[in-house]
């Protein structure tokens, strides 16, 4: 059994989240994850889910009674989701920490927007896929 | 030329983000995107980047002078990143809108944590990949 299981059960007690009524009105994450089989689609969703948990854990970082459980779960998330790759984890954390209300951050984000957009679709990576996609989709008026 | 280019240039003027000094102290997103070639890694990062832009655009939704530019860029993001898949976009939006301070959301998130964790690594999907990954990583103390 993975280490996180015991610690997650501990968190369930702490948050009073073991009761069946918690499942009322549908799920937060599980229903959404069921919709996506493609690895790249799953990563889009899991990226948001993982950042949610990290934010949640941050809010409880001073609570000693669940400190060990939180740390163990975060370690396991780092192994499972980031494949123990510290650079991947660091880059992810940088992105989640940018403040959308910081004027310098806003200016940089807008400055980079065209290049970010150009890289958004997988098609942007290879000319061949781009071309076939365009033939398939129909021509764009702007092209 | 894609429609977003002209509109992004318009936003650059509005945010005063065309000056060379904007690039001082490194990039927000471009440097990070350069680090990741694997499609699934890119999606992890792009998921955070796209949610940042959507948040940023939301903050300026009442500013009529950039309304058309923002709408056009969002349209193009929906095509490029979500492949015009409304369900993908809706699921993504649900995830970004969950409040980490809402007690019911916290309870649900902890309730679902074990199952979310079990699905985090691609390895969870196929036994073969799981085995090779374990050999690569070395044995975990718990195994």
């Amino acid at each position: 059994q993975d280490p996180y299981v015991k610690e997650a059960e501990n968190l369930k007690k702490y948050f009073n989240a073991g009761h069946s009524d918690v499942a009322d009105n549908g799920t937060l994450f599980l229903g959404i994850l069921k919709n996506w089989k493609e690895e790249s689609d799953r990563k889009i969703m899991q990226s948001q889910i993982v950042s949610f948990y990290f934010k949640l854990f941050k809010n409880f970082k001073d609570d000693q009674s669940i400190q060990k459980s939180v740390e163990t779960i975060k370690e396991d998330m780092n192994v499972k989701f980031f494949n123990s790759n510290k650079k991947k984890r660091d880059d992810f954390e940088k992105l989640t920490n940018y403040s959308v209300t910081d004027l310098n951050v806003q200016r940089k984000a807008i400055h980079e927007l065209i290049q970010v957009m150009a890289e958004l679709s997988p098609a942007a990576k290879t000319g061949k896929r781009k071309r076939s996609q365009m033939l398939f989709r129909g021509r764009r008026a702007s092209q | 030329q894609d429609p977003y280019v002209k509109e992004a240039e318009n936003l650059k003027k509005y945010f005063n983000a065309g000056h060379s000094d904007v690039a001082d102290n490194g990039t927000l997103f471009l440097g990070i995107l350069k680090n990741w070639k694997e499609e699934s890694d890119r999606k992890i990062m792009q998921s955070q980047i796209v949610s940042f832009y959507f948040k940023l655009f939301k903050n300026f939704k009442d500013d009529q002078s950039i309304q058309k530019s923002v709408e056009t860029i969002k349209e193009d993001m929906n095509v490029k990143f979500f492949n015009s898949n409304k369900k993908k976009r809706d699921d993504f939006e649900k995830l970004t809108n969950y409040s980490v301070t809402d007690l019911n959301v916290q309870r649900k998130a902890i309730h679902e944590l074990i199952q979310v964790m079990a699905e985090l690594s691609p390895a969870a999907k196929t036994g073969k990949r799981k085995r090779s990954q374990m050999l690569f990583r070395g044995r975990r103390a718990s195994q």
Epitope: K37, R140, A141 | P3, E71, E75, N78, K86, K88
Partner: antibody
Amino acid sequence: EVQLLESGGGLVQPGGSLRLSCAASGFTFSSYAMSWVRQAPGKGLEWVSAISGSGGSTYYADSVKGRFTISRDNPKNTLYLQMNSLRAEDTAVYYCAKDLTVGGPWYYFDYWGQGTLVTVSS
Amino acid sequence: NFMLTQPHSVSESPGKTVTISCTRSSGSIVSNYVQWYQQRPGSAPTTVIFDDDQRPSGVPGRFSGSLDSSSNSASLTISGLQTEDEADYYCQSYDSSNVVFGGGTKVTVL
């Protein structure tokens, strides 16, 4: 109340041209992608073309690519379909349809016009 | 390209329930929304179900939509069938630049 009213249909010879219009009212036209969907006599529905709300991006079914051009005039709340090099198999009722949600095209429709009949025959 | 396959026709007596299936040939039915349109003879289509299972305002509660991932299909159920429900019904979905309609199902109220 959302209303879509197509016009411009009629009888045309093979190889000929026709321009369809769709006058829209009751919603913020420029916020929604729009599509043309056709239905051959006694047949099912076939998507033809779409255009983003801003008008900057257009999309076509393979069957009409290079022959049809979709466009819109947002100040006039009007959608167009320019049809060139028409063939017998283009004979159909042509509907304009509004996207369900802003930010598209999402290719799901909540309102349709009453349709205009295009007949291609010699 | 995927296809959406519907039964050609179904018929039932007033007050009864009919279910129309819409089976996706490839790709997952749950990874894209399914929409259902009603088309009465000589009229334009109208939406009866959007986003898999949502009803537009004005559409009676007798209409419901669902997905079944095990059969990779969507279903439209009309309960308490009425004479005005007699029409053609089309399912529709979208994936990777393909806008796909089912072939349509003619519902006859006996």
